[in-house]
Interface confidence: medium
């Protein structure tokens, strides 16, 4: 069961896996949650009654029964991992710890004006896990204003000590705030020949890449497929690093694949969620239980529901045996990966889906797109909302996109003449406007946040956030879309769609059914040629066919320009303005969302 509260002056006895150092009990709980085996923890706070060498220790624990005996101990704080919980989890930690020196390998030192600048440097440095900043009150003039970037093998400090006039904190890469580039390509027939920091078994290069992404020291990887000539190395995933952050040597080798950690865009890709099934594949590991199951899907469910299960192998039933039920082997290992992978024995293997909640909800696969046609089907665009005004009468005002459980991203120009958020209603999970009746549930708007540089759509900054009065429960018909990663600025999106209930031609009416149109992106240079009287800035993005015919139009404003990349949908643009609708050589102009990621995060993550 899910227990979120911390137990003060309480120590769990036994079950120790490992000890790490964390600056707070709250962060200890996060570390426990992300550790493959940790279910409980005991943290020691600073206290005069405690030996200072034990301050800030975070002991990660495991137990077959999922609990351990409790002992009273001053300064001890204990609790449970969030693995047992169903809510979304994030490793993002923006806290700044005053008078704490988090120790690690100090590999870079430079002068910074503030702790925030130091944290930004850490976030944009490929090796940095955390930092310590000597403030301007630091007594040693020699080290005043010095920003120390640090890393360790585990990503957590090797020790934490009290130190006056310094502050420490963590990299914000896991908060989607890094400007580092994301190299998403997987390179076939390639071996990266740099030093290995770890190796695990993986069924394919994609799982290997995800493991690399959440491993604190991994910058790139090499995976040896099951056809690799050396049998002992088949399915081996080598996690690698280098001083420069890039592979120094690439060797052409058949049946090997290599790629990069997607650390700085992990909020918009699945990292922990390995949802595929691997046929004719057996995962070896420590056996937790053997249960009868009707199918491999049922076996995966059993694994997902057993908190200690990390992966499974299902062996289908022999004809008419055991009521047609096969054997479901629930397994675990020290690192969450199989200890060995065997092929050709008829098993079907996979991973627990319990860890999917550690990924952003926006990365969840949605139902396949309906090809052709202009009318959408239910659940096709689950992030699309219709924003209604109730004054003077209720009507559709603009589109918008769900980007968080309390947040809608839309266009600023939608709120011309809107005096108060009280007159706004947000409807989600809607396909047809006619579904909206008096008693249809909606989300009230608590706050409208318009970009403070917005003047008019054509001059840019046409972006606004709506904070909802209540939170959205994610379902198949209402869920968020991923924001693009700052590291993906150079990605060329080829599968982009504009959606909305807007006009189908310039003089028309709001459509009943949500419309969709696949539209190619246009370069800003090309777009500028089409709009000589306007300044097309890098904060705008354009899309449209040269011959016209498909475009957003009145009523689509604020809605999404959604682009699919690596199986994940990204909110690339917000419908903003254009000359007429679907006119020849007049592309639609959209707010370029990637340029506002910092602004969005600043507003939505404000404490």
């Amino acid at each position: 069961e899910c227990v979120t509260q911390l137990l003060k002056d309480t120590c769990f006895e036994g079950g120790d896996i490992t000890t790490v150092f964390t600056p707070s009990a709250k962060y200890c709980q996060v570390v426990c949650t992300y550790h493959p085996r940790c279910l409980l923890f005991t943290f020691t706070a600073e206290s005069p009654s405690e030996d200072p060498t034990r301050w800030f220790t975070c002991v990660l624990k495991d137990s077959v029964t999922e609990t351990l005996p409790r002992v009273n101990r001053t300064a001890a704080i204990s609790g449970y991992s969030f693995k047992q919980c169903s809510h979304q989890i994030s490793a993002c930690n923006k806290d700044i710890y005053v008078d704490l020196d988090m120790k690690g390998i100090n590999y870079n030192s430079s002068v910074a004006k503030s702790a925030q600048e130091c944290q930004e440097r850490c976030t944009d440095d490929v090796h940095c896990h955390f930092f310590t900043y000597a403030t301007r009150q630091f007594p040693s003039l020699e080290h005043r204003n010095i920003c120390l970037l640090k890393h360790t093998q585990t990503g957590t400090p090797t020790r934490i000590t009290k130190l006056d006039k310094v502050v420490s904190g963590f990299s914000l890469k896991s908060c989607a705030l890094s400007n580092l580039a994301c190299i998403r390509d997987i390179f076939p027939n390639t071996v990266f020949a740099d030093s290995n920091i770890d190796s695990v078994m993986a069924p394919d290069a994609f799982v290997c890449g995800r493991i690399c992404t959440h491993h604190p020291g991994c910058l790139f990887f090499t995976f040896f497929s099951q056809e690799w000539p050396k049998e002992s190395q088949r399915n081996l995933c080598l996690l690698k690093t280098s001083e420069s952050g890039l592979p120094s040597t690439r060797i052409k080798k058949s049946k090997a694949l290599s790629g990069f950690s997607l650390q700085s865009c992990r909020h918009s890709i699945p990292v922990f969620c390995h949802s595929s099934f691997y046929h004719d594949t057996d995962f070896l590991g420590e056996e937790l239980d053997i249960v009868a199951a009707k199918s491999h899907e049922a076996c995966q469910k059993l694994c997902t529901n057993a908190v200690r299960c990390q992966f499974f192998t299902y062996t289908p039933a022999q004809a008419s045996c055991n009521e047609g039920k096969g054997k479901c082997y629930l397994k675990l290992s020290s690192n969450g990966s199989p200890t060995k992978i065997l092929h050709g024995r008829g098993g079907i293997s996979g991973y627990t889906l319990r860890l999917c909640k550690m990924d952003n909800e926006c990365t969840t696969k949605i139902k396949p797109r309906i090809v052709g046609g202009t009318a959408s089907v239910r659940g096709e665009w689950p992030w699309q909302v219709t924003l209604h005004t109730t004054s003077p009468t209720q009507r559709h005002l603009c589109g918008g996109s769900i980007i968080g459980n309390q947040w809608i991203l839309t266009a600023a120009h939608c709120f011309y003449g809107v005096e108060s958020p009280k007159i706004l209603r947000v409807y989600s999970g809607i396909l047809n406007q006619s579904e909206i009746k008096e008693d249809t549930s909606f989300f009230g708007v608590q706050e409208i946040i318009i970009h403070d540089q917005y003047k008019m759509a054509e001059s840019g900054y046409d972006i606004a956030l709506l904070k909802l009065e209540t939170t959205v429960n994610y379902t198949d018909s209402q869920r968020p879309i991923c924001l693009p990663s700052k590291g993906d600025r150079n990605v060329i999106y080829t599968d982009c769609w504009v959606t909305g209930w807007g006009y189908r031609k310039l003089r028309d009416k709001i459509q009943n059914t949500l419309q969709k149109a696949k539209i190619p992106l246009v370069t800003n240079e090309e777009c500028q040629k089409r709009y000589r009287g306007h300044k097309i800035t890098h904060k705008m993005i354009c899309a449209g066919y040269r011959e016209g015919g498909k475009d957003a139009c009145k009523g689509d404003s604020g809605g999404p320009l959604s682009c699919k990349h690596n199986e994940v949908w990204h909110l690339v643009g917000i419908t903003s303005w254009g000359e007429g609708c679907a006119q020849r050589e007049r592309p639609g102009v959209y707010t370029n969302v990637v340029e506002y990621v910092d602004w969005i995060l600043e507003k939505t993550q404000a404490v």
């Epitope: 020196d101 100090n106 030192s109 002068v111 040693s140 003039l141 020699e142 130190l163 310094v166």
Partner: antibody
Framework: QVQLVESGGGVVQPGRSLRLSCAAS????????MHWVRQAPGKGLEWVAI?????????YYADSVKGRFTISRDNSRDMLYLQMNSLRAEDTAVYYC?????????????WGQGTLVTVSS | DIQMTQSPSSLSASVGDRVTITCRAS??????LNWYQQKPGKAPKLLIY???SLQSGVPSRFSGSGSGTDFTLTISSLQPEDFATYYC??????????FGQGTRLEIK
Amino acid sequence: QVQLVESGGGVVQPGRSLRLSCAASGFTFSSYNMHWVRQAPGKGLEWVAIFLSYDGSNKYYADSVKGRFTISRDNSRDMLYLQMNSLRAEDTAVYYCAKSEILVVPTLDYWGQGTLVTVSS
Amino acid sequence: DIQMTQSPSSLSASVGDRVTITCRASQSISSYLNWYQQKPGKAPKLLIYAASSLQSGVPSRFSGSGSGTDFTLTISSLQPEDFATYYCQQSYSTPPITFGQGTRLEIK
């Protein structure tokens, strides 16, 4: 590996000048604060001067040498210098150049082997 | 300037002994204290920084403790190569860096 090699020591008369050099290798010289520390024969360690890496104007001296000694560095050649003017008998010592580590607590983590300066008439 | 006072100024001990050297600062220096070892004719070598952190490559028989004004360096079991002079150094309020006068550790 980190290496610091001092040179330029010798016998000099009171009132005269001497320039000590320290050649650094094995680390990114320009990123580190550099010190001179001295040790009179049979005595303890005495800090002399520091040159901060991040600000060319940040040079600091012990009261005993202020106005007479000048610390300088050439980052393009990975060299640290100590220009000693108006030398006195009490300046007789082994002079060490030392690198300051980037721990939050400043430390002198690497030292040269030292060069002996004897001020005598 | 902060004054550092070491005691004793010299001491004799045998191989295998546990030895403690103390260092006192003229005002509180938090844990901004380092310890160095110097052998005759050689440059000093950093042993312990920030009062209690062991510099990499230094044997674990060396340990440091203390905070504020009083600090100690302990050698749990003396080895022949440990006979040398030991200096404490404050890096709390610098410049100037100030050293203790040194403690000479001799073979009994």
